[in-house]
Each structure stands twice: as structure tokens, then as C-alpha cells.
């Protein structure tokens, strides 16, 4: 049974130009995390194995950086890096667990956080 | 047109070591990692780890962690995969193959492949 | 690790025949699935990736289906060059991990 929940950094907004950390936390389960998945729409940024470490995708390899921790960040935003962010958690023995993150890049200097909030 | 060449079959006593090489052309090297995938005798394919040469981060299947090496000489656009401590069952066709341009995990170029034959 | 079991392990089949592999995971690697071809004494092919993306030249009568645990390769009308081994292949989880093959003969 999978008793674990994904906090994620939620909804948020940063500068065209800036950067920001996609953040997931898995809280309330002892499954050992074996991989986690960073995923933008269908497409695969970056991989963190526990026993491979991390690796960027080559099409992000100037832009993305790992971490902090299991976390991701994205620099030198622009308004195409708009959308939805996946964090996949790999995890033995409970299986897969995905959170969600929606970045906006705003032209403005104004970027204002979202709340966190939790995906069962 | 992407070519991968590989160095030609090695025969080698138990406890040895084998380097093989795999020159690439046609494509900019650093932008495609790099893997190594192996198929004893009449058998399926097993991996081995991966390369990137874009900064050398490395990634080895745990089942060869501390036996395998995987490096990368950018002036010359060729990749090695040295395996160490050489036993019987090592007794294999060793490829390379290129990382998938919208996945690095799947491959769309191989080499031809070597023959490493471990006897003694 | 992921086990991907591929079945059947061999099978005979005639020219013009549909042909149906199927490849099971152990565990939801959604579709991050390739196939590929080969042939005896030669390198693999990449034929399918992504579960049902036809691979740049791959002739349209290859074709990938499936998501999640079960994935399918169909050749719709098999050619004289098609008989070979295929190989499924997992890429959402390290190690990266491949079916144990099935040997496509002439009957």
C-alpha cells in the first residue's frame, strides 16, 4: 500500500532571465527512493539514481543543474519554460509517486511564489 | 553521417584487463551521451553504463561498479570502456551506442561491436 | 531492476504473415519502451522508441504499441529481410534493462 504524499513547491512564478528550484519532497512513507525523474510536459530533463547519480538531458545541459538535494534548478528562464514540471519518485517497495509544478515566466519584475501544497 | 568505430577483438588471460575503444564522427560529440552494452554468446544484451562527454559524468550498472571505467577524449571524439578483473563469463561482444536525441536511454547508433574473449 | 520478459522466444512465420512480439515489465515504465532488430553477426537496429514512434527509415509496416506493463511489436506483412531477433528494451528506470529476445525464423 502507498502511504506516502509529494509536497511540492506548487504553483510559481519567476522572472524571464532568472532562475528557480523546483523542489519535491515524499514525506510519510519508508520506501527507499531509488530514482527520481525530472520531467517537463513529455519530456526528460534530468535523472538522479541513487546509485548512478545525477544526468541532464543533453538538450538542457546549459540551463538545468542539479539540486539542491533531489530538487532541480532552471536557469536562464524564458517565457517557453511556462508550464507543467513533473517529479517522479521511484520507490521500492511502494512503486511511483509524482508530483506537480506549475511555472510561469513572467515578462515583469514582479514573480510572486505559489503555496506549497501536497499530491497524495 | 553518424558512424561509431570500435577497435578490433582482444583475447585475454582471467585476472586481465581490456580497454576498448569507440571513435564517433558525424555528429558534435558532446552533445549525445555515450553507452556501452555487451551480449555474451548467443545471449540477450546487458548494459553496461553510460558517458557523457560533454563533461565526462559517468554512470556503470551496479553489477560492474568497480570493475568498469568509461572515458571520453574529446580531440579525438573516442569513448573507452575498460573492464577490469576479466573472468570467463566476461566472454562477450562489447557495442557502443549513442543516446537518442529526445531520450539519452535508448539508442539510436551502434557500433559494430568487439569480440572479448577471456581464456585461459 | 526492471525485467522486461519478451515472448515468445522464437517463432516461425512465413512471408506476408502478421507478427505480433509482446514484452512485459515488471513494473509501470510508462512508455519508455524501444524495440530493436537484429541480425546475426551485426549490431542492433533501433526500430521503435518512445513504445510506438517508428524510428527515422523504419519501413511503416513496424509498428509499437502499448503503456505502462505491456508492450507489442507487429510487423503487418513480414519480408524476406525482417527475419531476425528483436529485443525490447526499458529506459525509465537504471539500470536500463532489455527483453531476452525473439528469434523471428523462416517456416
Known amino acids: 500500500m502507498m502511504t506516502g504524499t509529494i509536497e511540492t513547491t506548487g504553483n510559481i512564478s519567476a522572472e524571464k532571465g532568472g532562475s528557480i528550484i523546483l523542489q519535491c519532497h515524499l514525506s510519510s512513507t519508508t520506501a527507499q527512493v531509488t530514482q527520481v525523474n525530472w520531467e517537463q510536459q513529455d519530456q526528460l530533463l534530468a535523472i538522479c539514481n541513487a546509485d548512478l547519480g545525477w544526468h541532464i538531458s543533453p538538450s538542457f545541459k546549459d540551463r538545468v543543474a542539479p539540486g539542491p538535494g533531489l530538487g532541480l534548478t532552471l536557469q536562464s528562464l524564458t517565457v517557453n519554460d511556462t508550464g507543467e514540471y513533473f517529479c517522479i519518485y521511484h520507490t521500492y517497495p511502494d512503486g511511483t509517486y509524482t508530483g506537480r509544478i506549475f511555472l510561469e515566466v513572467l515578462e515583469s519584475s514582479v514573480a510572486e511564489h505559489g503555496a506549497r501544497f501536497q499530491i497524495p | 553521417e553518424v558512424q561509431l568505430v570500435q577497435s578490433g577483438a582482444e583475447v585475454k588471460k582471467p585476472g586481465a584487463s581490456v580497454k576498448v575503444s569507440c571513435k564517433a564522427s558525424?555528429?558534435?560529440?558532446?552533445?549525445?551521451?555515450m553507452h556501452w552494452v555487451r551480449q555474451a554468446p548467443g545471449q540477450g544484451l546487458e548494459w553496461m553504463g553510460l558517458?557523457?562527454?560533454?563533461?565526462?559524468?559517468?554512470g556503470y550498472n551496479r553489477k560492474f561498479k568497480g570493475r568498469v571505467t568509461m572515458t571520453v577524449d574529446t580531440s579525438t571524439s573516442t569513448v573507452y570502456m575498460e573492464l577490469n578483473s576479466l573472468r570467463s563469463e566476461d566472454t562477450a561482444v562489447y557495442y557502443c551506442?549513442?543516446?537518442?536525441?529526445?531520450?539519452?536511454?535508448?539508442?539510436?547508433?551502434w557500433g559494430q561491436g568487439t569480440l572479448v574473449t577471456v581464456s585461459s | 531492476d526492471i525485467q522486461m520478459t519478451q515472448s515468445p522466444s522464437s517463432l516461425s512465420a512465413s512471408v506476408g504473415d502478421r507478427v505480433t512480439i509482446t514484452c512485459k515489465a515488471s513494473?509501470?515504465?510508462?512508455?519508455?519502451v524501444a524495440w530493436y532488430q537484429q541480425k546475426p553477426g551485426k549490431s542492433p537496429k533501433l526500430l521503435i522508441y518512445?513504445?510506438?514512434n517508428r524510428y527515422t527509415g523504419v519501413p511503416d509496416r513496424f509498428s509499437g504499441s502499448g503503456s505502462g506493463t505491456d508492450f507489442t511489436l507487429t510487423i503487418s506483412s513480414l519480408q524476406p529481410e525482417d527475419f531476425a531477433t528483436y529485443f525490447c528494451?526499458?529506459?525509465?528506470?537504471?539500470?536500463?534493462?532489455f527483453g531476452g529476445g525473439t528469434k523471428v525464423e523462416i517456416k
Open positions: 551506442a549513442r543516446g537518442g536525441p529526445s531520450n539519452w536511454n535508448y539508442f539510436d547508433y
Open positions: 558525424g555528429y558534435t560529440f558532446t552533445d549525445y551521451y
Open positions: 558517458v557523457y562527454p560533454y563533461n565526462d559524468n559517468t
Open positions: 513494473q509501470n515504465v510508462v512508455t519508455a
Open positions: 518512445s513504445a510506438s
Open positions: 528494451q526499458q529506459y525509465t528506470l537504471y539500470p536500463l534493462t
